[in-house]
Interface confidence: medium
């Protein structure tokens, strides 16, 4: 062929026409190609009707071709493998009537803000769907209903806040979930089912530790050698489980599946019996795990500790009260978010160490309705207001710009931003031991604060409070089994991880598969 | 053509900062991810920070927290906010472009030279 | 972090003459998915900035003469210069961009003997 390269191999006839300025399908290929490379093209557009005429076509590469937009027509009847993986897409085309056979769909690495309900509608023998580092805070529930033999699902390195709680129901043969490096707080009570998982990456997420947090803290405790971190090049034959990574973002990296939930409602007359599936409460300590019931006590002043407030939240608060237009590294005290508490337990973590520090107290009476009032928003001490600019990209950063807290793995892909701020060039420096500044009294809005960061609201908006800390040293401390660190961080969100570094989506797909 | 003109070098104390940018023309800026390439005076090459097309920063531990990449699409620039400098940092650097996040760099500037030096 | 190793660090050519040049990776740079081997070529000629010679291993850049080839997969990778000429003079550096942080070789510095 006079562009692209062809070759035959086996039964295959692949055709190459990769990196050759192609803005579109190059005439006369062979009309029995079964593999079609365009990769790194200036494809920009791109009708999948211009391959009918090949309907041997099992595997269209389009990755890297500035695609903006993916035309779905005609029929591509044994098409098994598409990969659309580093282009510009920001939604996702429906394939289902296209792609009738469609077995792997990668769509890493583009601009996905959201997936519509029907996205998959119609990819009945879909097996792997790679979603990792686009920009989704939410997914549709039923969104993997039509995908019943999934195996493989990533969403890593994305703004996800939260799960349908349903997210996985019929998903019987899914063996890995890629979880890992997303804003995830908590996890839905009955999330991971029945049935067994394999191989669960779910660290790099900020998971609040409180009485919400039992569901999924008893699931890593029952399915704690199916808990990995990943690690580029390594065979999972070799791959040590870690459910120590999975950590709790307001208590200094205290694992999640050691959490005590002292305070928590439990089986009884006091509690909830509906809150964590019927998972009694513990109380671990060391190697003993001792089943407890407690009275629940709602405190009328807020334990301020080593690591900030502890509080939950609602989940409707965070859409509501969440800015949609600020960039994971960017940081904004135009409002100080905050969220209205469900209920507060009096707890304390077990640590080596705790003690109560000396920040300021935040004194919050609750009143008896607590989701009626809005809370008030309050501007945060010692940090520079940022102007925002209609200019939809990254800022500009400031000369000297407070640190930035930093995730123990790599970043994910940041939430869209249509309105960023520019800081200004020298923004007033915050002490570095700021005078205590009280928090006034809300009627039942407790301002969320976290020592090292900020507010708790997952990779949103920042205020420097007392103690700049880095969390990758908190990190390094409570991992040692981890051969070594993770060594590519990003602010805020870390993502060493290319598309590459998922298990099975790429260098590795070989090694995960079941042995 | 292609071109990528690094500026905002210099003398810098440690513990000072300093902010290199990096002018693209010849491409579309926003479709490319970009990145910042470090070599210390008679050695080797040192990846330094990226920036996907979508603007998430990527850093190596060596500059982590000290160092931030952005990126101004609407003014075909990129940059490199460089806080706590140390005398370690003094480098060339150099912004180079790559398709995506995860490819070569195809395209190199001039670079710009930083001293820290007290 | 994959480590990368290039030998020799020097290496006197006639021109001409063949030259190769070797890279190793600490770990596999091969791609399962796509068959490629993630691995770049760079050639940093005196004064001037590195410019891309070889992506994927073996893949030439355009513009660049096709003297130069690569080759390899895995962990072993090799640079060859057909017939070396004058201007080819440099410091030629390998760069993994299979698993971040990316990585370079230290650089085998070719010069006209």
């Known amino acids: 062929h006079p562009i692209c390269e062809v070759s035959k191999v086996a039964s295959h006839l692949e055709v190459n026409c990769d990196k050759r300025n192609l803005t579109a399908l190059p005439p006369d290929l062979p009309k029995d190609t079964t593999i079609l490379h365009l990769s790194e093209n200036l494809l920009y557009t791109f009708s999948l009707a211009t391959l009918m005429p090949y309907t041997r076509l099992t595997q269209l590469n389009l990755d890297r071709c500035e695609l903006t937009k993916l035309q779905v027509d005609g029929t591509l009847p044994v098409l098994g493998t598409l990969d659309l993986s580093h282009n510009q897409l920001q939604s996702l085309p429906l394939l289902g009537q296209t792609l009738p056979a469609l077995t792997v769909l990668d769509v890493s690495f583009n601009r996905l803000t959201s997936l519509p309900l029907g996205a998959l509608r119609g990819l009945g023998e879909l097996q792997e769907l790679y979603l990792k580092g686009n920009e989704l805070k939410t997914l549709p529930p039923g969104l993997l209903t039509p995908t019943p033999k999934l195996e493989k699902l990533s969403l890593a390195n994305n703004n996800l806040t939260e799960l349908p709680a349903g997210l996985l129901n019929g998903l019987e043969n899914l063996d890995t979930l890629l979880l890992q490096e997303n804003s995830l707080y908590t996890i839905p009570k009955g999330f991971f089912g029945s049935h067994l998982l394999p191989f669960a990456f779910l660290h790099g997420n900020p998971w609040l530790c409180n009485c919400e947090i039992l569901y999924f803290r008893r699931w890593l405790q029952d399915n704690a050698e199916n808990v990995y971190v990943w690690k580029q090049g390594v065979d999972v034959k070799a791959m040590t489980s870690n459910v120590a990574s999975v950590q709790c973002d307001n208590s200094d990296k205290f694992p999640v599946y050691k959490y005590p939930g002292k305070g928590c409602p439990t089986l009884g007359d006091e509690g909830d019996t509906d809150l964590y599936d019927y998972y009694p409460e513990e109380d671990t300590e060391g190697d003993k795990v001792r089943a407890t019931r407690t009275v629940v006590k709602f405190p009328t002043k807020a334990h301020t500790t080593p690591w900030g407030l502890f509080y939950s939240w609602s989940t409707a608060s965070l859409d509501s009260q969440m800015p949609s237009s600020l960039h994971p590294t960017q940081e904004s005290t135009k409002e100080q978010t905050t969220f209205p508490p469900r209920w507060t337990p009096n707890f304390t973590l077990h640590m080596e160490s705790i003690t109560f520090s000396k920040t300021p107290k935040s004194t919050t009476e609750p009143t008896p309705s607590p989701t009626t009032s809005e809370p008030v928003p309050e501007p945060a001490p010692n940090m520079t207001t940022l102007e925002p600019t209609p200019s939809p990209t990254t800022p500009e950063p400031t000369s000297e710009p407070a640190p930035s807290p930093t995730t123990p793995e790599p970043t994910s892909e940041p939430a869209p931003s249509p309105t960023t701020p520019e800081p200004t060039s020298e923004p007033a420096p915050s002490p570095t031991t700021p005078e205590p500044t009280p928090i006034p009294t809300i009627a039942t809005s407790p301002t969320i604060l976290v020592s090292a960061t900020s507010l708790i609201t997952p990779k949103s908006t920042f205020l420097t409070t007392t103690k700049p800390v880095s969390l990758l040293e908190s990190t390094k401390k409570t991992i040692p089994e981890l051969d070594q660190p993770p060594k590519l961080r990003g602010v805020l969100q870390g993502h060493l991880e290319s598309s590459r570094n998922d298990p099975f989506l790429h260098p590795d797909f070989c090694c995960l598969l079941p042995l | 053509q292609v071109q990528l003109v690094e500026s905002g070098g210099g003398v810098v104390q440690p513990g000072r900062s300093l902010r290199l940018s990096c002018a693209a023309s010849?491409?579309?800026?926003?479709?490319?991810?970009m990145s910042w390439v470090r070599q210390a005076p008679g050695k080797g090459l040192e990846w330094v920070a990226s920036i996907t097309s979508a603007g998430t920063p990527y850093y190596p531990d060596s500059v982590l927290g000290r160092f931030t990449i952005s990126r101004d699409n609407s003014k075909n620039t990129l940059y490199l906010q460089m806080n706590s400098l140390r005398a370690e940092d003094t480098a060339v650097y150099y912004c180079?472009?790559?398709?995506?996040?995860?490819?070569?760099?195809?395209?190199w500037g001039q670079g710009t030279l930083v001293t820290v030096s007290s | 972090d994959i480590v990368m190793t290039q030998s020799p660090l020097s290496l006197p050519v006639t021109p001409g003459e063949p030259a190769s040049i070797s890279c190793k990776s600490s770990q596999s740079l091969l791609n399962s998915r796509n068959q490629k081997n993630y691995l770049a070529w760079y050639l940093q000629k005196p004064g001037q900035s590195p410019q891309l010679l070889i992506y994927?291993?073996?893949t030439r850049e355009s513009g660049v003469p096709d003297r130069f080839s690569g080759s390899g997969s895995g962990t072993d990778f090799t640079l060859k210069i057909s017939r070396v000429e004058a201007e080819d003079v440099g410091v030629y550096y390998c760069q993994q961009h299979y698993s971040s942080p990316w990585t370079f070789g230290q650089g085998t510095k070719v010069e006209i003997k």
């Open positions: 994927f291993t073996s």
């Open positions: 180079a472009r790559s398709r995506g996040y995860e490819d070569y760099f195809d395209y």
């Open positions: 010849g491409f579309t800026f926003s479709s490319f991810a």
